[in-house]
């Protein structure tokens, strides 16, 4: 996170780390005891799910191994529509007031809307900073008329825009399929943006979580 | 200060096989994507493909596809490059490129390997 | 797939002259334009990013300009180490990342 700040700690009961042996890949979302959401484009062969801290590599964090993933069908690592993917973890989280899962949203939240995003990402960029903290940046909902005079076609209809103008806080390295919560509810996951991270006016782009809700329920009930 | 260090020159039989590596040495490449890009002699840059280091996932330029793969060990920071069924029009330089950006995208090259030069000849 | 034009495709040029290379797209980029420097043997490298964007460590005589189809890399006064053949290409419809066909500087 670039310009961001600390997260209140305990605040992001539903934060999690994807990581590759024991270092960050990406972020992710607790959405139910046994899954995980993300973005397609953090696709391993497995991963080590840390749960249950702001502390990235916290010993007395919850680790969970997941050998199983399903990315969104539609996923297109050409255009990268569709950038969403559940993780099932190999056993069930021990819920806690440390560990909680997030609410999928009821609707679409409207541009101008205030949400935070989080992740244990870089605050450096090019050169990268990777902090041990939880970082937050609080951002607003930018409509995709907004958004396209900045990206044009490159954003998707199921692509969601988000950011301060004239400010440099967004999301970079390490944060993707991270959470951007908006009025308590999953919004969108961090999926890509302009390099170096942190060019003023230039939005972070997420996957719009409202519009994938019923692929979220349907793949979790497939795969129980 | 990372840097990109490729494997050396190779001289093959057409109808063979190629692989080239590419090594990150003082770092890694794991936020990115690799990208081959080559130059046959006196001739201008063309692009192969790449890499996502994030997630193995792989686009190839469609002149190659069928031909050419390309994989990445992330243990030891290197990327690979194999290059099928030879014909001397493959002759030329093979680079290695970091692809910068973040998440999904990935906008432009700002790191390069040395080149190797490969040669096909009967 | 996007076809990127350099022109010209050689050019011959002065110590101190002020260099205009141009690139046009076959179709809009919007500004995901990038121009790299290539000397004979040698490895190509990052100058200019998303058209106007100076790569750090890059000097100050290089800039880069242009949105939707035309741009231009200016090079303001010349000097000996730029006598080399540059490159742009285009990240706006990737893959396939598309290469300009080069420009040669050479020495008058």
């Known amino acids: 996170i670039i310009d961001g700040y600390k997260c209140k700690e305990g605040s992001h009961p539903w934060q999690v780390a994807l990581l590759k042996g024991n270092q960050l890949h990406c972020g992710g979302v607790l959405v139910d005891k046994y899954w995980v959401l993300t973005a397609a484009h953090c696709k391993m062969g497995q991963y080590q799910v840390q749960l249950g801290s702001d502390k990235i590599g916290d010993q007395s964090a919850q680790k969970i191994k997941a050998t199983k993933s399903f990315r969104h069908p539609g996923y297109s690592t050409k255009t990268h529509v569709n950038d969403i993917m559940l993780v099932r973890l190999d056993e069930p989280v021990k819920m806690s007031s440390k560990v909680e899962a997030v609410q999928l949203p009821e609707h679409c939240e409207p541009p101008g809307t205030s949400c935070t995003v989080s992740g244990w990402g870089t605050t450096t960029s090019p050169d990268v900073t990777f902090p041990s903290d939880l970082m937050c940046s609080d951002v607003k909902l930018i409509s995709s008329r907004e958004c396209k005079k900045v990206y044009k076609d490159l954003l998707g209809k199921t692509m969601l825009c988000a950011g301060i103008p004239d400010s440099k806080t967004n999301t970079c390295n390490g944060d993707s399929g991270g959470p951007l919560v908006c009025n308590d509810t999953l919004q969108g996951l961090v999926s890509w943006g302009t390099y170096p991270c942190g060019q003023p006016n230039d939005p972070g782009v997420y996957t719009q979580v409202c519009k994938y809700k019923r692929w979220v329920m349907e793949t979790m009930k497939t795969h129980r | 200060q990372v840097q990109l260090v490729q494997s050396g020159a190779e001289v093959k039989k057409p109808g063979s096989s190629v692989k080239v590596s590419c090594k990150a040495s003082?770092?890694?490449?794991?936020?990115?994507?690799i990208s081959w890009v080559r130059q046959a002699p006196g001739q201008g840059l063309e692009w192969m493909g790449w890499?996502?280091?994030?997630?193995?996932?792989?686009n190839y330029a469609q002149k190659l596809q069928g031909r050419v793969t390309m994989t990445t060990d992330t243990s030891t920071s290197t990327a690979y490059m194999e290059l099928r069924s030879l014909r001397s029009d493959d002759t030329a330089v093979y680079y290695c490129?970091?692809?910068?950006?973040?998440?999904?995208?990935?906008?432009?090259?700002?790191?390069w390997g040395q080149g190797t030069m490969v040669t096909v000849s009967s | 797939d996007i076809q990127m034009t350099q022109s010209p495709s050689s050019l011959s040029a002065s110590v101190g002259d002020r260099v205009t290379i141009t690139c046009r797209a076959s179709?809009?980029?919007?500004?995901?334009l990038n121009w790299y420097q290539q000397k004979p043997g040698k490895a190509p490298k990052l100058l200019i990013y998303?058209?106007?964007s100076l790569q750090s460590g890059v000097p100050s005589r290089f800039s880069g300009s242009g949105s939707g189809t035309d741009f231009t890399l200016t090079i303001s006064s010349l000097q000996p180490e730029d006598f080399a053949t540059y490159y742009c290409?285009?990240?706006?419809?990737?893959?396939?990342?598309?290469f300009g066909g080069g420009t040669k500087v050479e020495i008058k």
């Open positions: 490129a970091r692809a910068a950006g973040y998440g999904a995208r990935h906008w432009y090259f700002d790191l």
């Open positions: 003082g770092g890694t490449f794991s936020n990115y994507a």
């Open positions: 890499i996502s280091a994030y997630s193995g996932d792989t």
């Open positions: 179709q809009s980029i919007s500004s995901y």
């Open positions: 998303g058209a106007s």
């Open positions: 290409d285009q990240s706006y419809s990737t893959p396939p990342i598309t």
